[in-house]
Each structure stands twice: as C-alpha cells, then as structure tokens.
C-alpha cells in the first residue's frame, strides 16, 4: 500500500511491494519526485551545476566550500561535481587559531589585525 512506503520508496504495482527509489550517482541529484509510495515517470538524476557537488544517493547538490571568500584559506583541491573543495593553509594576512575546536567545515582563518603578538603567520 502506498502509505506504508518510506521516504525513498515507491509502490511497485507489478509486485505489490514498496521498492527503493533508484539512487543517483556521485555528481548528480534527484530530479522530480520519488518516495512515500509515488514515483514520477520522468524521475531521474541530473548533474550538479558548477560550484556544487554531491556524493550521490538521494542527496541534493551542495555548494563547494568557499575556501578563500569565507574561510580566508587557500584552495588545496578545487571541488568538482563529485567532491567538495579542500582548503589549505590560511591566506596571507590571516592566521589559524591554535587549540580551537574545528567547526563543521574545519579551521577558520582570522585576520592578522586581530592576532596576538608574535603570531608566526603574521610576523613580517
């Protein structure tokens, strides 16, 4: 029965059972609806646009980390359709706080204007 199907399941009228919605591959996101018992006939997977990535499954494409603009860090590896960007050391004029817990993205770099004296990234 339709109502018994889960978030990523549709009701297969041939078998009379709930069936898993086809997952998308890395670098893709679902297009149109599938789940809770129904599946659009044109349900499918579309590519992530530029600056976004997805690991596949039912995940929508998410923006790459903005290493330079948001984290004030260098780009170690630029992101592609399948992978997030990886950030490297801080940009010139910025430093990383030691002994600070990483946030969900990793370390954030702070302006040398706010740095304690003799912060190595900010000397010279």
């Amino acid at each position: 029965e339709y109502s018994n199907c889960g978030e990523n399941e549709y009701y297969n009228q041939t078998t009379g059972l709930c069936q898993e919605c086809p997952p998308c591959g890395p670098g893709e996101e679902p297009y149109l609806s599938c789940g809770y018992g129904t599946k659009d006939e044109d349900y499918g997977c579309v590519p992530c646009p530029a600056e976004k990535f997805s690991k596949g499954g039912y995940q929508i494409c998410r923006r790459h980390k903005d290493c330079e603009g948001f984290f004030r860090a260098t780009v170690l590896t630029p992101g592609d359709m399948e992978n997030d960007a990886e950030c490297g050391p801080c940009l010139p004029g910025y430093y990383m706080l030691e002994n600070r817990p990483r946030n969900i993205y990793g370390m954030v770099c702070y302006s040398c204007l706010l740095a304690p004296p003799n912060t190595k990234e900010c000397v010279g």
Partner: antibody, heavy 119, light 107 residues
C-alpha cells in the same frame, strides 16, 4: 539484433498524413522514455517529441505541436509518431531514440526512416 | 528556447592530432550537455553525457569539459574512424536543442 528500428517513411503530399513506427528489442521497452528526433537534408538534428515510459508525460517541439502525436504500445514494444498536415519543411530523416534510465539524454538511436513531403 | 551554437561547422585535422570542438549555449545549462557522433552513413551514437562522462563503450580518447554556457569535446589522438559530424545537445530545458554540428575531416 538492432535495438531500435524505424519504419513507415516514404513520399507524402503536402497536407497529407503518415504514421511512423519504431520497433524496440533487446531491452525492457516499458522502462524507458522515448523520443523522436529528425534531421532535414544537410541540416542538424532537431528534437521533436518525447513520451515517458507509461505515457503519462508527453512533450512536443513548437514546430510539430498540434500536428504530430507521439504514442506507444508497451505490450508490442513499439513507439509511434502520427504526422498530419505535413509540410515540405517536414521532409527529413526521422530517428527514434531511447532515454537512458534515470538520465536525460538519448543513449540508443535507430537508423532512421526518411519522410519526403512533396507534390 | 536555448540556442546551441557550434561556431566551427567543419574542421580539418591529421590523424594523431588533438582536436577540440566547442559548443556555446545561449544561457547557463548547468552541465546538462551531451555530445553525439553522426557517421557519414547517418548512424548516431552518444559519446559524452552530463558534460564530461564517457558513455559505455566509447574510447577514452574522447573527453568533455565545460560549465555554464561554454563546453568542449576533445579527441586526444584522432583516428580514421572518428571522421564524422559531432553535435552538442542541451537537456536542461524543454525543448531539448542541438548545436548545428561540426564536421570533422582528414587533412
């Protein structure tokens, strides 16, 4: 075995009608959306119609809307294109093409059938 | 409708050459770009889908790249069997549209 084979082409007078068929084999026809794409002599490819796997969704290009009808018979593994009010500019090679499962491109093409509209 | 433009309608190259065919969309198509090969006998085959993914059975000398409105198909080591016309196609917005084609010939 050829997965898609078109038939029904030929010479038609302007204003006339023609029905093209595309026989599918070697894959589960009822799982796939299907397209018609055409190519006028010495011109590029032109998408003209699409039908989803169970016929719920049907789309046409503006050039054929109201004149052409796409349909399918999943029991007979056959795709159709009913063409009416034909014009000289409809003269082309007509290809049927399969929509890849889950994705939005034409992954298998037939060899085409030629329609010539001329008096 | 989204217009797809292949500025080079014909291209002459030597066997073994690296050949690049370009395609431009009239608006951002977000990587919904596919490439097809049409042989002189009219046979059409999918080469590349979603900008850069090689369709099964297609030789690895074919590759695709691009984003936004600008895309390209590269053949790294041209072979005799690659003599054909190449079409780009956008699948982002109905109606799906093709470029005018680039005919590849041997010098």
């Amino acid at each position: 075995e050829v997965p898609l084979e078109e038939s029904g082409g030929g010479l038609v007078k302007p204003g006339g009608s023609r029905k093209l068929s595309c026989a599918a084999s070697g894959f589960t026809f009822s799982d796939h959306g299907m397209h018609w794409v055409r190519q006028a002599p010495e011109k590029g490819l032109e998408w003209i119609a699409y039908i989803s796997s169970g016929s719920s969704n049907v789309y046409y290009s503006d050039t054929v809307k109201g004149r052409f009808t796409i349909s399918r018979d999943n029991a007979k593994n056959t795709l159709f294109l009913q063409m009416t009010s034909l014009r000289s500019e409809d003269t082309a090679m007509y290809y049927c093409a399969r929509r890849e499962l889950l994705r939005f491109y034409f992954d298998v093409w037939g060899a085409g059938t030629t329609v010539t509209v001329s008096s | 409708d989204i217009q797809m433009t292949q500025t080079t309608s014909s291209l002459s190259a030597s066997l073994g050459d690296r050949v690049t065919i370009s395609c431009r969309a009239s608006q951002d198509i977000g990587n919904h770009l596919n490439w097809y090969q049409q042989k002189p006998d009219g046979t059409v085959k999918l080469l590349i889908y979603y900008t850069s993914r090689i369709h099964s059975g297609v030789p690895s000398r074919f590759s695709g790249s691009g984003s936004g409105t600008d895309y390209s198909l590269t053949i790294s080591n041209l072979e005799q069997e690659d003599i054909a016309t190449y079409f780009c196609q956008q699948g982002n917005t109905l109606p799906w549209t093709f470029g005018g084609g680039t005919k590849l010939e041997i010098k």
